[in-house]
Amino acid sequence: RTTTCFGDGCQNTASRCKNGGTWDGLKCQCPNLYYGELCEEVVSSIDIGPPETISAQMELTVTVTSVKFTEELKNHSSQEFQEFKQTFTEQMNIVYSGIPEYVGVNITKLRLGSVVVEHDVLLRTKYTPEYKTVLDNATEVVKEKITKVTTQQIMINDICSDMMCFNTTGTQVQNITVTQYDPEEDCRKMAKEYGDYFVVEYRDQKPYCISPCEPGFSVSKNCNLGKCQMSLSGPQCLCVTTETHWYSGETCNQGTQKSLVYGHHHHHH
């Protein structure tokens, strides 16, 4: 957030940018959490996403029996590895073709035992609040499909009649990692030292990271005619003075008529 400064006072402003703000010759460029002419104000809402997509990674091991292991397969830049990678990727693309969340495979290691293929199956889905269920279902389908293909595509009389053949017992799922999206945690982190005062509220299934100074939410602080301002000790109402009234109180809800006070003073003098 930026505020432009014109005139003689600008040089003074330059040295007074607060909260890590930097002077660009015209104005203070404020870090994400701050705004105002001097970056002196704390924002009342922080954009926390959500991300467009959520990813999952399944660590799998399969044993390919239609290729004999050679030392060259350990070298990822060798012609042997590159050819194996191409065939294995094509085979897995066929195996997982019915899974909309499937992105691809990534071979991490090839080792002896016919060819033991340690690899990751990569999944991705659009973010919705149900993303965990969607990815959990996809990982179950991956398990079913790889189990099926490694049971069906096997060597017969020492020859494979498929693109690749497998050892039925060599298929294992080592680990499943889903990218965790935790709006509460993100909100707390991005609010930094004000983290205790920012909360997540949902609107149309979208999370909003807000402080009580953001109007229109259930946690919003009503400062009446005053202004809500965030400080390290929490949100506070800065009360205004009008031509006719002074306002005070925690929510600036106590108004004192100036004329009454002045009248009172005149009476005493």
Epitope: T65, T70, E72, Q79, T87, C160, M163
Partner: nanobody, 123 residues
Framework: DVQLQASGGGSVQAGGSLRLSCAAS????????MSWFRQAPGKEREGVAI???????GYADSVKGRFTISQDNAKNTLYLQMIGLKPDDTAMYYC?????????????????WGQGTQVTVSS
């Protein structure tokens, strides 16, 4: 780029014999595998025979006992000796190669292909 060129095809009577050759541009596949495939009109390409650098050979059931695959690494050449030819053996014959020590007679497992040579067996 690896080049494979098949030759030796022709027309023979049933029961006759032919020897096919496949010349590779270099000895790249001496540590991998080479194979012969064939494709009859209107049919899918099918595996005939395979030889690997470890000396292993494999054959399709339909040609076992009649066809013999071999290679001469010094000449970078693959051979297919065919005897007792039948009209069913009529097809375009292709050689294929791989850097991998393969045990697969599915064309999708093979990445490098030569031009075909036609074999016609009449009754």
């Amino acid at each position: 780029d690896v080049q494979l060129q098949a030759s030796g095809g022709g027309s023979v009577q049933a029961g006759g014999s032919l020897r096919l050759s496949c010349a590779a541009s270099d000895n790249t596949f001496s540590r991998g595998s080479m194979s012969w495939f064939r494709q009859a009109p209107g049919k899918e390409r099918e595996g005939v025979a395979i030889i690997s650098s470890d000396g292993w050979t494999g054959y399709a059931d339909s040609v076992k006992g009649r066809f013999t695959i071999s290679q001469d690494n010094a000449k970078n050449t693959l051979y297919l000796q065919m005897i007792g030819l039948k009209p069913d053996d009529t097809a375009m014959y292709y050689c294929a190669a791989s850097f991998l020590v393969l045990r697969a007679l599915n064309p999708k497992a093979w990445h490098y292909w030569g031009q075909g040579t036609q074999v016609t067996v009449s009754s």
